[in-house]
């Protein structure tokens, strides 16, 4: 790994769990970007593997609202506009970090959590298993 | 919004910036999932809008490694297996939260940051602008 000299102006931490418990400023840098994926692009409707977006809300999580993609079809839309089952619509998933209130219902204490979210769908060639 | 009663066992915060500065436990819940997208699925190679994955590393960020997708072609792969410019490969982007060391090089002090990452690519019908 890369060793970086510690900044002498860093806050102190007396916490016995240090460095597992850290201070985080929730005043988000780059806050003004768009969080509703429907507004930011219409790819979900124009894709050959179109998807619907579902709102997942959890007040114990930060961010409390996450949008989940669900592929509309098992197959993909072909050049004629029909669903073609020779191909598969599959979700593209990504692991993201969220903050989970811990203990529950606490406004100023969180734990990092990794969750897997479906961001959109793509059209793939199916894996064909040949029987001997 | 939903009002949730505060848990009486919550840690106190004397910080003048409260509730902007919070305590976060970095001992990640669900840590054992796979962070290298190449290992978790081969969709990037099997998609009709295939993509390459590029490793983006920043020691001042948590997580320090993020994988970025770059579409391989402007067009998509058609039913014959050829690059076809009647369709477009486009990146599916998602906003994610990361922790940025603030002040820089501090091991226990962070600020939340929103960044836009490309997770994969999908094949879309192009928007055709008709000239009057």
């Amino acid at each position: 790994g890369i060793t970086i000299p510690r900044n002498p102006g860093c806050p102190n931490s007396e916490d016995k769990n240090f460095p597992r418990t850290v201070m985080v400023n929730l005043n988000i840098h780059n806050r003004n970007t768009n969080t509703n994926p429907k507004r930011s692009s219409d790819y979900y409707n124009r894709s050959t593997s179109p998807w619907n977006l579902h709102r997942n809300e959890d007040p114990e999580r930060y961010p409390s609202v996450i949008w989940e993609a669900k592929c509309r079809h098992l197959g993909c839309i072909n050049a004629d506009g029909n669903v073609d089952y020779h191909m598969n619509s599959v979700p593209i998933q990504q692991e993201i970090l969220v903050l989970r209130r811990e203990p529950p219902h606490c406004p100023n204490s969180f734990r990092l959590e990794k969750i897997l979210v479906s961001v959109g769908c793509t059209c793939v060639t199916p894996i064909v298993h040949h029987v001997a | 919004g939903i009002t949730i009663p505060r848990n009486p066992g919550c840690p106190n915060s004397e910080d003048k910036n409260f509730p902007r500065t919070v305590m976060v436990n970095l001992n990640i819940h669900n840590r054992n999932t796979n962070t290298n997208p190449k290992r978790s699925s081969d969709y990037y190679n099997r998609s009709t809008s295939p993509w390459n994955l590029h490793r983006n590393e920043d020691p001042e960020r948590y997580p320090s490694v993020i994988w970025e997708a770059k579409c391989r072609h402007l067009g998509c792969i058609n039913a014959d297996g050829n690059v076809d410019y009647h369709m477009n490969s486009v990146p599916i982007q998602q906003e994610i939260l990361v922790l940025r060391r603030e002040p820089p090089h501090c091991p226990n002090s962070f600020r939340l940051e929103k960044i836009l990452v490309s997770v994969g690519c999908t094949c879309v019908t192009p928007i055709v602008h008709h000239v009057a």
Partner: nanobody
């Protein structure tokens, strides 16, 4: 950077056989078509054989019944089996993946001569 590496070229006697192979690095071939083109000295590049993503094959009239194209997605290769070779098959053979706007190999020389 995507590389298509051709192998198997060289000198062969008329009536002989040769197998050309093309291996792709960094990309999977399952989504792509595969093809072999050739260019003889002083002539234009011509399509010899192609195989679609789903395994449908097409051949130039001059090689039908003598050449066989195949694609192995597991091994990430496109191959050309050439039998009953003739002097007029002498050319630089190029591997192609993904059609005209896809990826091209550097070429391998095939010389049919006694």
């Amino acid at each position: 950077q995507v590389q298509l590496v051709e192998s198997g070229g060289g000198l062969v006697q008329p009536g002989g056989s040769m197998r050309l192979s093309c291996a792709a690095s960094t990309i999977g071939l399952s989504i792509y078509s595969g093809a072999w083109y050739r260019q003889a000295a002083g002539k234009q590049r011509e399509l010899v054989a192609r195989i679609t993503r789903r395994g449908v094959t097409n051949y130039a009239d001059s090689v039908k019944g003598r050449f066989t194209i195949s694609k192995d997605n597991a091994k990430n290769t496109v191959s050309l089996e050439m039998n009953s070779l003739k002097p007029e098959d002498t050319a630089v053979y190029y591997c192609n993946v993904g059609g005209e706007d896809g990826y091209w190999g550097q070429g391998t020389q095939v010389t049919v001569s006694s």
